[in-house]
Interface confidence: medium
């Protein structure tokens, strides 16, 4: 069995994490965005989850069964987490305080098993995502053995209810990622986080990383029966980490623009399969050069911007006379966009310069998502009579 984390600097405390969820109704098309008619309101209570107490948990009270009484009472799922670890529980717990939202969707989970086995229990999958690119967790929850003798029965779920009117489940498998969206510079190395935890008695069968981009799907890395195979050159997954730390994170060295896209980490156990989706964005910083096309009466300035990705770039021109302050200049024209073999973009901006009587300094400034602050190049344009 997996051990619970040991107390570290702070004290570990077991708390109930209550989440507002939607339950996808049976028959609703799974995998698509469910409409409001296909979904019912639900609550998920993760029971006694160990979280690190930084002193902010004093006012937390455990979930009381009758506290959610409303005109349209939601279905309440109580999920014990004794069999697995939920390492990102703090993020779920503190989402409200940090101005983030948690989206939660619960749906029936169907095992590829015989009818007789399925009739003895029911399974649900809960997908939770913290907004702003935070953690994402998928849980497989199992209800106790179903017997018709139960006093309380849920009419639509066709499941027994606890005396408090909740659906009791136990989490048997979870797959999570700490970051749903990542941005890395072209040429750098990326680590895509994917971790899992499973109940004792379950065996790890396979790990599969896939990339989907612009309608294309391709296998990146697969691990099965103790053997790892990288389809994308250099992709690595640490087999020792799989067994020890339940860490299926993928490392991609030497990123190219072809590596950009949606990565799916799929973990298959002897009973369950779950996945996480991670968006990898590649960025390349532009380089800027400013040159003079000719030295006629009205010289033309050419600002070459190259090697940037993604496509969106903002180019501004400013003019500053000696002793004056910079003023933005309009009237620039752009060359056609070029794309290099590596996939980065290049463009040129042209501007007719007016040096004035004393000369002026022109600056071409480039703003791009990959830059912390705009990048600029400047040159001085002197009037014709001062050119020697």
């Amino acid at each position: 069995a997996e051990t619970k984390p040991h107390p570290a600097e702070g004290q570990w405390r077991a708390v109930d994490v209550v989440l507002d969820c939607f339950l996808a109704k049976d028959g609703a098309h799974r995998g698509a965005l469910a409409s409001s008619e296909d979904r019912a309101r639900a609550s998920l209570v993760l029971k006694q989850v160990p979280v690190l107490d930084d002193g902010s948990l004093e006012d937390f009270t455990d979930f009381q069964g009758g506290t959610l009484a409303q005109d349209d009472p939601p279905i309440i799922f109580e999920a014990s987490v004794d069999l697995v670890q939920i390492p990102q529980a703090e993020a779920l717990l503190h989402a409200d305080c940090s101005g983030k939202e948690v989206t939660c969707e619960i749906s029936r989970y169907f095992l590829q098993m015989t009818e007789t086995t399925v009739k003895t229990a029911a399974w649900f999958m809960a997908n939770m995502q913290v907004s702003g690119g935070g953690p994402s967790i998928s849980l497989v929850m199992k209800t106790p053995r179903v017997t018709k003798n139960e006093a309380l029965w849920h009419p639509t779920l066709n499941l027994p209810l606890s005396p408090q009117g909740t659906v009791r489940t136990a989490v048997e498998f979870q797959v999570m990622t700490q970051t749903q969206s990542l941005s890395f510079l072209l040429g750098s190395s990326a680590s895509l986080d994917c971790g899992f935890s499973m109940a004792p008695g379950l065996d790890l069968i396979s790990v599969e990383w896939r990339l989907q981009h612009k309608g294309r799907g391709q296998l990146v890395y697969s691990w099965t029966a103790g053997q790892g195979q990288a389809v994308r050159k250099g992709a690595t997954l640490e087999p020792a980490q799989l067994g020890m730390a339940r860490d299926a994170s993928l490392t991609l060295p030497g990123l190219t623009i072809q590596d950009e896209g949606t990565y799916i980490c799929q973990i298959t156990t002897s009973l369950y399969r779950a996945q996480q989706i991670i968006q990898l964005n590649i960025q390349a910083s532009p380089k800027v050069r400013l040159s003079l096309a000719n030295e006629a009466l009205l010289p033309t300035l050419i600002c070459d911007i190259a090697g940037y990705y993604p496509l969106d770039v903002v180019v501004t021109w400013t003019r500053e006379e000696l002793g004056g302050s910079p003023a933005q200049v309009s009237g620039a024209s752009f060359s056609s966009l070029r794309q290099s073999v590596a996939g980065t973009y290049s463009i040129s901006s042209s501007l007719t310069a007016e040096p004035g009587s004393a000369g002026a300094t022109y600056t071409c400034q480039v703003t791009h998502i990959s830059l912390e602050e705009p990048l600029g190049a400047s040159t001085q344009v002197v009037p014709p009579e001062r050119r020697t």
């Epitope: 380089k287 050069r289 400013l290 040159s291 003079l292 096309a293 050419i302 070459d304 190259a306 090697g307 060359s335 070029r338 290099s340 290049s346 040129s348 990048l375 190049a377 400047s378 040159t379």
Partner: antibody, heavy 117, light 106 residues
Framework: DVQLQESGPGLVKPSQTLSLTCSVT?????????WHWIRQFPGNKLEWMGY???????NYNPSLKNRISITHDSSKNQFFLNLNSVTAEDTATYFC??????????WGQGTLVTVSA | ENVLTQSPAIMSASPGEKVTMTCSAS?????MHWYQQKSSTSPKLWIY???KLASGVPGRFSGSGSGNSYSLTISSMEAEDVATYYC?????????FGSGTKLEIK
């Protein structure tokens, strides 16, 4: 693989024009990149002289004033340096260089030009 | 023009010794680039964009810095590192080189 080769007279008389050619193989001059002339004086000081870009725009070192001109012939895949009114101070090893935005990634082997009567 | 001052002008190091040379710019630059030149050959791009190693450059070399101050470091000197190293700025015109640091071996 991009390769550059300088050629031209090794001896130029003062007040005359220094003319050098850089022949580029493995890449088309007009496909991209910037094509530079750089010189190294006898004391090893390096000086950037100017460039011509893939689109034909030029940029010169102001210290060379109106003495310098860089042009290219795309049909021959060559670019040229003309430096007029030379003096003994222009004695140097002249390099042509190409860059793909990572500054002078490609260099010629250099050619020594002596300015002397 | 942006004057690049390199120090020291000449230095010597024993094999295995850590070597650091600096380049100071009179005006702030976005990036600094470094070239290695061995006698009677053309300079080679060695470090670009401040810290990226050019193709074929050993991992014992590193570059760092920002604004007006940059440096090139060799973690463990080897005989093949004997050369002159020039810093170069491409952020403003005219493009300028440093005067060079000549690295010798003890």
């Amino acid at each position: 693989d991009v390769q550059l080769q300088e050629s031209g007279p090794g001896l130029v008389k003062p007040s005359q024009t220094l003319s050098l050619t850089c022949s580029v193989t493995g890449y088309s001059l007009t496909s991209g990149y910037f094509w530079h002339w750089i010189r190294q004086f006898p004391g090893n000081k390096l000086e950037w002289m100017g460039y011509i870009s893939y689109s034909g725009t030029t940029n010169y070192n102001p210290s060379l004033k109106n003495r310098i001109s860089i042009t290219h012939d795309s049909s021959k895949n060559q670019f040229f340096l003309n430096l007029n009114s030379v003096t003994a101070e222009d004695t140097a090893t002249y390099f042509c260089a190409g860059d793909d935005w990572d500054w002078f990634a490609y260099w010629g082997q250099g050619t020594l030009v002596t300015v002397s009567a | 023009e942006n004057v690049l001052t390199q120090s020291p002008a000449i230095m010597s190091a024993s094999p295995g010794e850590k070597v650091t040379m600096t380049c100071s710019a009179s005006s702030s630059v976005n990036y600094m680039h470094w070239y290695q030149q061995k006698s009677s050959t053309s300079p080679k791009l060695w470090i670009y964009d401040t810290s990226k190693l050019a193709s074929g450059v050993p991992g014992r070399f590193s570059g760092s810095g920002s604004g007006n101050s940059y440096s090139l470091t060799i973690s463990s000197m080897e005989a093949e590192d004997v050369a002159t190293y020039y810093c170069f700025q491409g952020s403003g015109y005219p493009l300028t080189f440093g005067s060079g640091t000549k690295l010798e071996i003890k």
